[in-house]
Interface confidence: low
């Protein structure tokens, strides 16, 4: 028998710098978790016990933090080169920059393998790229060999930016083949190693011949056996075993998100290449464990770019933008509209000629509106202004949820109105009607919503059994501010881009805003 | 439960065009392939391509490249097949079917009958 | 592209036989084949997928199995509904092909 260490990341949304628990900002450095300097020291000791080690990424190293708005992925590659990964495949967030922005700082820098079987480019761009991102490879780990094949969510071109020139084949049909081919290289130890979520993960252990391992990300799943060591809650056993449609046992595994663990997968082959046994769990990346002092000296070493950026004008702003909770947390303001028409324009993706976009609707729950934004500063916007409108390091994110769930959720944002809680929504491409004078649950008096299979968008009553796209914090996607609604009924829920940088981006585009109160939210006569 | 209702029979002349529509309900409809299938007179089945409604991701046969389009209106619930250039040989039953978490075709619908004849 | 031949072309039996009917891969197709049911003017309906898991509904008399590029589907108890023809196809590759089929006729 022959044993590989398989160590994984997967969604580490650049949280390079260690984090708290609850992977935002760090403050107290003695409780921080994760980041490259720790993960490294671990990696380390790893490869210095095992003999077989293979360090691979399942995608979304792009997003999430400062570090990405302004390094644009070249702190990815420089960082993933120092912890000498060995391979990584493509998420969707790598992306959000377009292909050039995965091609300049990522692709031609990186000095790993990076892997895709189902992205497939035409046109022009397959010359361009082709060589910089591969199906699979065949990487040599002691005396056997090891074949990782890649993929990466089909749903990309709802969720960020890979132009047309890219297709986004099925996993299954684009995976086979691939794999076939490796078995006719004698290839006979297989790692899927992709980015569409926990459930297509099962479903290529399940259906592809001659995988004898999937590493997986996008859904942040976190697997566990025994007690867990923070607070995430286990979706199941670490390795998720799943048995193929020929009968084999294949191990599943993710490991969360934001670099908080490090998944440890120990796989015992045997000599025809057959798995015999699988164990491990994640690893939690806590302060227990010493940042390596040259990668830390690194990172405070890019870090200083990052401060300065903080400072620098993003665009001007010729209005108060009043996200006070006065206002937010009790009727329209245009600092709720401002973010939701952020949030929107973030998510423009014509890939359907009979709709003019995929999405219209954006809610936001009032109380994740922390600061107002003064236009007598000379109308100056910066990154810091913003981080103090949203504090949480949040993402906006793309969920599916039925016309009944909505009104479930605008129900809710009322339920105990006037007390200034933080569940009143702010919104956009709706027009909500409340009438306050009507018992909580039933004061919803009119929800109209943008159309998107339109020419020229215009507002129709919702329809409760039908099934809309909206765009909204990962907080409220979460059941954050009691909305339980949304998590449970929600029909699909796909992680988006950094709050800040959604904001800063679109101001930036913009150069000058000025968000108007415009009837988004009304009250009807009497009540308000 | 799952159902995927075609319209109705057609009859065309030789190089003209016929579309084929399919109406699924009982499931969401962007959740699940839609397959074209057709048999001949016959003959043994023959697969045309598929849609995957939830990103519009298609895959034709190469044997029917350049002559099928296959669509989707996911506000309706129903895909489309239309095939052009028609000759005498493409008289067949078309069926739309659609898969399941492990089967490809695991539900059909009815068959529509496309005769060719000048 | 992958030839599924079937054998035999047709065959008669009688209620309570046992029937086997066979499909050979021109290449080996691992376990990816599925078996179909169809009866005049109807659309195929799916029994067996990935050679040995019967689709919800198909009664425990059929059965099917074999691997690379031999395929069988069995019939332990033939009913006076089981008269129809039967396919078999591969979802081992595209593009996916079917066999050409076998008609199972009353003695």
């Known amino acids: 028998a022959w044993e590989l260490t398989i160590l994984h990341t997967n969604d580490v949304h650049s949280r390079l710098e260690q984090t708290s628990e609850d992977s935002s900002k760090c403050v107290n450095a003695s409780r921080c978790m994760g980041g490259v300097a720790r993960l490294f020291t671990k990696v380390q000791q790893i490869r210095r016990a095992e003999p077989n080690v293979l360090l691979l990424d399942a995608g979304d190293q792009y997003q999430g933090t400062i570090w990405f708005t302004v390094y644009k992925g070249a702190e990815v590659a420089h960082f993933m080169n120092a912890l000498r990964y060995d391979a990584m495949a493509l998420g969707n967030h790598e992306f959000d920059n377009g292909v050039e922005g995965l091609i300049e700082p990522l692709l031609k820098e990186a000095k790993f393998p990076i892997l895709s079987a189902n992205i497939k480019a035409k046109g022009p761009l397959a010359s361009q790229i082709s060589g910089l991102y591969l199906p699979y490879k065949v990487l040599p780990v002691g005396d056997e060999v090891v074949g990782i094949v890649g993929y990466t969510s089909k749903e990309t071109p709802f969720l960020s930016n890979p132009g047309t020139n890219l297709v986004f084949e099925d996993e299954i049909t684009a995976l086979q083949p691939e794999v076939d081919k490796l078995k006719t290289l004698n290839v006979n130890k297989i790692i899927a190693l992709g980015h569409s979520g926990f459930e297509m993960d099962k479903l290529i252990a399940q259906k592809v011949r001659g995988v004898d391992v999937v590493v997986g990300g996008h859904s942040n799943t976190f697997l566990y056996t025994g007690n867990p060591p923070s607070k995430e809650v286990p979706a199941g056993k670490y390795p998720f075993i799943v048995t193929s449609d020929d009968g084999r046992k294949v191990p599943v595994v993710q490991a969360y998100a934001f670099g908080k663990y490090l998944g440890y997968l120990k796989i015992e082959f045997d000599e025809r290449g057959n798995v015999i046994s699988s164990h491990g769990n994640p690893i939690l990346l806590n302060s227990s464990i010493p940042e390596d002092p040259s990668i830390k000296a690194d990172i405070n070493k890019w870090r200083i770019k990052l401060d300065n950026y903080s400072t620098q004008e993003l665009g001007k702003t010729i209005v108060y933008l009043d996200g006070s909770s006065q206002s937010c947390r009790f009727r329209e303001c245009n600092m709720g509209n401002l973010i939701c028409d952020a949030m929107i324009n973030n998510n423009l993706r014509h890939t359907d000629e009979m709709f003019w976009n995929h999405v219209s609707m954006c809610i936001l729950n009032g109380g994740g509106i922390r600061s107002p934004i003064d236009e007598r500063n000379n109308g100056t916007i910066t990154w810091e202004n913003l981080a103090a409108v949203l504090p949480f390091g949040g993402t906006f994110d793309l969920v599916q949820l039925k016309g009944s769930t909505l009104k479930k959720a605008f129900e809710h944002s009322v339920h105990r109105y006037g007390q200034s809680t933080g569940e009143f929504l702010q919104v956009g491409g709706i027009h909500v009607v409340y009438d306050l004078s009507r018992k909580p649950g039933d004061r919803v008096v009119k929800l109209d919503v943008l159309c998107t299979k339109c020419r020229v968008p215009s507002y129709d009553p919702l329809k409760m059994d039908e099934v809309y796209k909206v765009i909204l914090p990962n907080f409220l996607a979460n059941g954050g501010d009691g909305f339980q609604m949304i998590k449970d009924e929600l029909l699909r829920h796909d992680s988006g881009d950094q709050d800040i940088n959604v904001v800063s981006t679109y101001i930036s585009k913009m150069k000058v805003i000025y968000p108007a109160v415009e009837g988004r939210i009304k009250f009807s006569t009497g009540s308000h | 439960q799952v159902q995927l209702v075609q319209s109705g029979a057609e009859v065309k002349k030789p190089g003209a065009s016929v579309k084929v529509s399919c109406k699924a309900s009982?499931?969401?409809?962007?959740?699940?392939?839609i397959y074209w299938v057709r048999q001949a007179p016959g003959q043994r089945l023959e697969w045309i391509g598929w849609i995957y409604p939830g990103n519009l991701n298609i895959k034709y046969n190469e044997k029917f490249k350049g002559r099928v389009t296959i669509t989707a209106d996911k506000s309706a619930s129903t895909a489309y097949m239309e095939l052009s250039s028609l000759r005498s040989e493409d008289t067949a039953v078309y069926y739309c079917?659609?898969?399941?978490?492990?089967?490809?075709?695991?539900?059909w619908g009815q068959g529509t009958l496309v005769t060719v004849s000048s | 592209d992958i030839q599924m031949t079937q054998s035999p072309s047709s065959l008669s039996a009688s209620v309570g036989d046992r029937v086997t009917i066979t499909c050979k891969a021109s290449q080996d197709v691992s376990t990816a084949v599925a078996w179909y049911q169809q009866k005049p003017g109807k659309a195929p309906k799916l029994l067996i997928y990935?050679?040995?898991t019967r689709h919800t509904g198909v009664p425990s008399r059929f059965s099917g199995s074999g691997s690379g590029t031999d395929h069988t589907l069995t019939i332990s108890s033939l009913q006076p509904e089981d008269f129809a023809t039967y396919y078999c196809q591969q979802h081992y590759s595209t593009p996916f092909t079917f066999g050409q089929g076998t008609k199972l006729e009353i003695k």
């Open positions: 079917a659609r898969d399941d978490n492990y089967a490809w075709f695991a539900y």
């Open positions: 009982g499931y969401t409809f962007t959740n699940y392939y």
């Open positions: 990935w050679t040995n």
